[in-house]
Interface confidence: medium
């Protein structure tokens, strides 16, 4: 089987504030199986902003249909975004277990907010 | 004005060892991810390396890894490419390419730098 | 990895005259899409990115549309300095990056 990869195409976008910012990840393969999650930053500090098994999340919504079996594309948007918005953020792929555990990551998005056009 | 200089290229044998240079210049070098690409004499154009702005992450092409590495010096504003174990298909022009900020296209590149690799 | 191919492989035509350059994916590549010309003796200079948009300096007679997987670079009326091979890059794809295998745009 092939081996998984995190595609995080875009190195960082730029959102005016209140506006909505789409963040693109797309998997390469469905194993192994288990959810996508994205975080804004890294390390012990990271915020979890979407979990595909969880919520709800009222600001993030998925671009496609992530409860169809053969989804591949977990791009998020994330609406009416404010400046504690900005970071980087990864999309990150869990692999199923009691806990659920940290397989693989993108390489990151860097999401800078611009003021709110006047 | 970006400029990029490529240099260290020449005529090697197989099996031989070389190592590529590029001087940048006309942007910020350190925060800018780089890649090296070629050109073999007739063909077309082959994504071979890139390394990040701090240099923590590199990538390869499966045709080279494990012979080359790419790497930088920033307080030079320099990246390089050592290349071991040298093939008769490595022969090709050698460029160094800056990545867009935003996306991974490539948005300068140097004029190149002649590898041929003859026994 | 994603696969490019372009056609033709060369274009014979004359000044004055309209190109058209197809480049297509073997899997979606959304509008991550760059075209490149380039020219012996000469850095390889970037067109188009994002399939449609010009990159700094380039005149408009050159256009690229298209989105997912095909993709067509337009040079509505050749002048001399055209003349030159032309590539598509891919860059949805994480590394390795890949290129088209080129379309050389020759006089006729």
């Known amino acids: 089987e092939e081996e998984l990869q995190i595609i995080q195409p875009d190195k960082s976008v730029s959102v005016a504030a209140g506006e909505s910012a789409i963040l693109h990840c797309t998997i390469t393969s469905l194993f192994p199986v288990g959810p996508i999650q994205w975080f804004r930053g890294a390390g012990p500090a990271r915020v979890l902003i979407y979990n595909q098994r969880q919520g709800p999340f009222p600001r993030v919504t998925t671009v496609s249909e992530t409860t169809k079996r053969e989804n591949m594309d977990f791009s998020i948007s994330i609406s009416n975004i404010t400046p504690a918005d900005a970071g980087t953020y990864y999309c990150i792929k869990f692999r199923k277990g009691s806990p659920d555990t940290e397989f693989k990551s993108g390489a990151g998005t860097e999401l800078s907010v611009r003021a709110k056009p006047s | 004005d970006v400029q990029l200089v490529e240099s260290g290229g020449g005529v090697v044998r197989p099996g031989e060892s070389l190592r590529l240079s590029c001087a940048a210049s006309?942007?910020?070098?350190?925060?800018?991810?780089m890649n090296w690409v070629r050109q073999a004499p007739g063909e077309g154009l082959e994504w071979v390396s890139l390394?990040?702005?701090?240099?923590?992450?590199?990538y390869y092409a499966d045709s080279v890894k494990g012979r080359f590495t790419i790497s930088r010096d920033n307080s030079k504003n320099t990246l390089y490419l050592q290349m071991n174990s040298l093939r008769a298909e490595d022969t090709a022009v050698y460029y160094c390419?800056?990545?867009?900020?935003?996306?991974?296209?490539?948005?300068?590149w140097g004029l190149g730098t002649l590898v041929t690799v003859s026994s | 990895e994603t696969v490019l191919t372009q056609s033709p492989g060369i274009l014979s035509l004359s000044p004055g005259e309209r190109a058209t350059l197809t480049c297509r994916a073997s899997?979606?590549?959304?509008?991550?899409l760059a075209w490149y010309q380039e020219k012996p003796g000469q850095a390889p200079r970037l067109l188009i990115y994002?399939?449609?948009s010009r990159a700094a300096g380039i005149p408009d007679r050159f256009s690229g549309s298209g989105s997912g997987t095909e993709f067509t670079l337009t040079i509505s009326s050749l002048q001399s300095e055209d003349f030159a091979v032309y590539y598509c890059?891919?860059?949805?794809?994480?590394?390795?990056?890949?290129f088209g295998g080129g379309t050389k745009v020759e006089i006729k």
């Open positions: 390419a800056k990545e867009n900020d935003r996306y991974r296209f490539f948005d300068y």
């Open positions: 006309g942007f910020t070098f350190s925060t800018s991810d």
């Open positions: 390394i990040s702005g701090s240099g923590e992450i590199t």
């Open positions: 899997q979606s590549v959304y509008t991550y």
């Open positions: 994002g399939a449609s």
């Open positions: 890059q891919q860059y949805y794809d994480r590394p390795p990056l890949t």
